[in-house]
């Protein structure tokens, strides 16, 4: 399977909420013998490999923000820790995997990475990640709502294959 980032850039005004999204593509096993681990973290756009560095999102690590669920399930972070920091990650039945950030500040600007680990029990595991940029703006140049820019299909940094 692959992970795609439908949007490579999100430009938002300060104080707005935003939902960053990754999507699983290709043959995703939805059986009982599959478990998915999914998480989010901040990173920097390295010269060689995007998403190598793992930095916290609003002081929450990728461990704090992770979800795990069976192939046939949906999931979301319900723990107070994430919500106290204005964060919620969620995953649906259709392969969409998102993190919602509330009340954005300029400090939230940066590169965000999603990581998905698929465990096929008694068989194998695969891990894939995707990257997208969030720009939070203030002042007269800021948009009134979030503006999203689609990823080009050729943008290999935003789709990694397992």
């Amino acid at each position: 399977f692959k992970v795609a980032t439908p949007y490579s850039l999100y430009v938002c005004p300060e104080g707005q909420n935003v939902t960053l999204t990754c999507r699983l593509l290709g043959p995703v096993d939805k059986g009982h013998d599959v478990t998915f681990y999914k998480t989010w973290y901040r990173s920097s756009r390295g010269e060689v490999q995007t998403c190598s560095e793992r930095r916290p999102i609003r002081n929450l690590t990728f461990q704090d923000l992770h979800l795990h669920h069976g192939g046939h399930q949906a999931a979301n972070t319900s723990h107070d820790l994430a919500q106290r920091h204005g964060l919620e990650s969620a995953s649906d039945h259709h392969g969409n995997f998102s993190i919602t950030m509330r009340n954005l500040t300029l400090l939230d600007s940066g590169l965000y990475c999603c990581l998905v680990v698929e465990i096929r029990h008694h068989h194998s595991e695969h891990r894939v990640h995707g990257a997208m940029e969030l720009q939070v703006q203030t002042g007269k140049d800021a948009p009134s709502n979030c503006v999203v820019y689609p990823s080009s299909s050729q943008d290999s940094e935003n789709i990694t294959a397992a």
Epitope: Q49, S52, Q63, V117, I119, H121, H129
Partner: antibody, heavy 120, light 106 residues
């Protein structure tokens, strides 16, 4: 602080089954974010992953050893085991148990290792 | 199986030298590679994960880089306590290790 401790016989006869146990302390083997695995190292040689068990009891095994390996887990005792059947001298090695973080990827905690010699 | 080829198998360098070890994967493993240090009689110790991330408490003289199939591990200024064998391991799929590099002091 998480600690892993291997135990079992240091000498096994050829064609018999090697049995080792790893006792985990300072953390729960039922934690959902981890694999619990076995790695071996023949004297003076490199590391070979044998297999791993998921908290739910599901397993991954090295394809080259799969027909001979079983890794049971006992969550009530906070331990997991290794059973390797039909051993030969080539199975003589230091056997390590280790924890592997699913999200990070590598084995982050290891036992100190136990030497197993296969000899008649 | 993903094969990991590590080189050199051994090296000897002086204290303060920059030491470089390479690891090559038989197929693309993105950046899902880790490096361990193993001192004689001890279990391996995690140094680096995701090719370049330093594990907690690991001295900054250790570093890693690379992506895809080719990876490099560097000790910037070799210290006497760095005498050990170093292993790479991929975790793009079921784990496999490199053959190891024994580092000695001249």
């Amino acid at each position: 602080q998480l600690q892993l401790q291997e135990s079992g016989p240091g000498l096994v006869k050829p064609s018999e089954t090697l049995s080792l146990t790893c006792i985990v302390s300072g953390g729960s083997i039922s934690s959902s974010g981890y694999y619990w695995g076995w790695i071996r190292q023949p004297p003076g040689k490199g590391l070979e992953w044998i297999g791993s068990i998921f908290y739910s009891g599901n397993t991954h095994y090295n394809p080259s050893l799969k027909s001979r390996v079983t890794i049971p887990v006992d969550t009530s005792k906070n331990q997991f085991s290794l059973k390797l059947s039909s051993v030969t001298a080539a199975d003589s090695a230091v056997y390590y148990c280790a924890r592997r973080d699913i999200l990070t990827g590598p084995f982050d905690y290891w036992g100190q290792g136990t030497l197993v010699t296969v000899s008649s | 199986d993903i094969q990991m080829t590590q080189s050199p198998s051994s090296l000897s360098a002086s204290v303060g030298d920059r030491v470089t070890i390479t690891c090559q994967a038989s197929q693309d493993i993105t950046n899902y590679l880790t490096w361990y240090q193993q001192k004689p009689g001890n279990a391996p110790k995690l140094l680096i994960y995701d090719a370049s991330n330093l594990h907690t408490g690991v001295p900054s003289r250790f570093s890693g880089s690379g992506s895809g199939t080719d990876f490099t591990f560097t000790i910037n200024s070799l210290q006497p306590e760095d005498v050990a064998t170093y292993f790479c391991q991929q975790y793009d799929n079921l784990p496999t290790f490199g053959g190891g590099t024994k580092v000695e002091i001249k």
